[in-house]
Interface confidence: medium
């Protein structure tokens, strides 16, 4: 049957119907990436602020990343959002630093609160930065007499604080 | 207490304008980035425009662009909308809200009423 | 312009029951930026879940959000009374901030 015939169509061709030879190659731009396909799927292009990883081939599709100052968002790269610095968030109006008592220490994300030392008991022994968390240290009770435990306030723009 | 407080919503007729007004209290305002979304009778929520917090950076939608205007008085702790041109449709309950950018609006305005009728 | 549209437009059940919303993005959102509102007539809306997952100060833990890319849900594991209202689903990934459509959550 033309069902059997077609099965017998590799990677990179396709089940062409209108022709006596039934196995036909995919056109350029296009590819299969497995046996039996009535059609051959177009090639994924990167263009704009993708740029190809992988070429399209006829059994396989491009693959592409994302041009400098920008990463891959989503399955296969299907998005490319903006690079930020350390110390930044991302929002909808671009880069923006982190608000005090948050840090980044990435090119992307989002700003976290710094650690609360005083919830596992522990002192600051580092303040944070916009770029780093803060490093806790020994519990108060460990350092020696006159030592100061500082505990960062919540993060200023955690929905539902109001910084005064 | 954050409180935000609008006003000067009213009748008025299509190409007529109006001014409203957000007062803000309880927080840092020129800290902030803000915004107002407005909802038309029995519809779901549409966002307007935004300012960034020194007044410097606006947005807006596409439905008003060109005929709204978005600012603040960062010494008065007050946001204002200006809309000149009004047409029928943007008959809405017009709300000011704290913007925290990635993460949404944490505190809303009770709304004001803007009626565009002849 | 990344369009949410939410399913479905009205949720009928009892108090006690479990409450699932679905809140679909026409492209990938990252899921920081996706938050989750509650309205009740003639109020305006409060903030329930922001980062697609947390939740905002004040909101009961019967409340939750999940999801990433393109598919976001709200659940409230049993309903009370006070629950009963419209959902917003809502995107600050890109301009034109945008909501859904809203779901009803009604009393069966």
């Known amino acids: 049957s033309l069902q059997d015939l077609c099965s017998n169509c590799p990677a990179g061709t396709f089940c062409d119907n209108n022709r006596s030879q039934i196995c036909s190659p995919c056109p350029p731009n296009s590819f299969s990436s497995a046996g039996g396909q009535r059609t051959c799927d177009i090639c994924r292009q990167c263009k704009g602020v993708f740029k190809t990883r992988k070429e399209c081939s006829s059994t396989s599709n491009a693959e592409c990343d994302c041009i400098s100052g920008y990463h891959c968002l989503g399955a296969e790269c299907s998005m490319c959002e903006q690079d930020c610095k350390q110390g930044q968030e991302l929002t909808k109006k671009g880069c923006k630093d982190c608000c005090f008592g948050t840090f980044n220490d990435q090119k992307r994300g989002i700003c976290r609160p710094w650690t609360n030392c005083s919830l596992d008991g522990k002192s600051v022994l580092v303040n944070g930065t916009k770029e780093r968390d803060v490093v806790c240290g020994p519990s108060p009770a460990d350092l020696s007499p006159g030592a100061s435990s500082a505990t960062p306030p919540a993060p200023a723009r955690e929905p539902g604080h109001s910084p005064q | 207490e954050v409180q935000l407080l609008e006003s000067g919503g009213g009748l008025v007729q299509p190409g007529g304008s109006l001014r409203l007004s957000c007062a803000a209290s309880?927080?840092?305002?020129?800290?902030?980035?803000m915004s107002w979304v407005r909802q038309a009778p029995g519809k779901g929520l549409e966002w307007v425009s935004d300012?960034?917090?020194?007044?410097?950076?606006?947005d807006y939608a596409d439905s008003v662009k060109g005929r709204f205007t978005i600012s603040r008085d960062n010494s008065k702790n007050t946001l204002y909308l200006q809309m000149n041109s009004l047409r029928a449709e943007d008959t809405a309950v017009y709300y000011c809200?704290?913007?925290?950018?990635?993460?949404?609006?944490?505190?809303w305005g009770q709304g004001t009423l803007v009626t565009v009728s002849s | 312009e990344i369009v949410l549209t939410q399913s479905p437009g009205t949720l009928s059940l009892s108090p006690g029951e479990r409450a699932t919303l679905s809140c679909r993005a026409s492209q990938s959102v990252s899921s920081s930026y996706l938050a989750w509102y509650q309205q009740k007539p003639g109020q305006a809306p409060r903030l329930l879940i922001y980062g697609a997952s947390s939740r905002a100060t004040g909101i009961p833990d019967r409340f939750s959000g999940s999801g990433s890319g393109t598919d976001f849900t709200l659940t409230i594991s049993r309903l009370e009374p006070e629950d009963f209202a419209v959902y917003y689903c809502?995107?600050?990934?890109?301009?034109?901030?945008?909501f859904g459509q809203g779901t009803k959550v009604e009393i069966k």
């Open positions: 309880g927080f840092t305002f020129s800290s902030y980035d």
């Open positions: 809502q995107q600050s990934y890109s301009y034109p901030v945008t």
């Open positions: 809200a704290r913007d925290l950018m990635v993460y949404g609006f944490d505190y």
């Open positions: 300012i960034d917090p020194t007044g410097s950076k606006t």
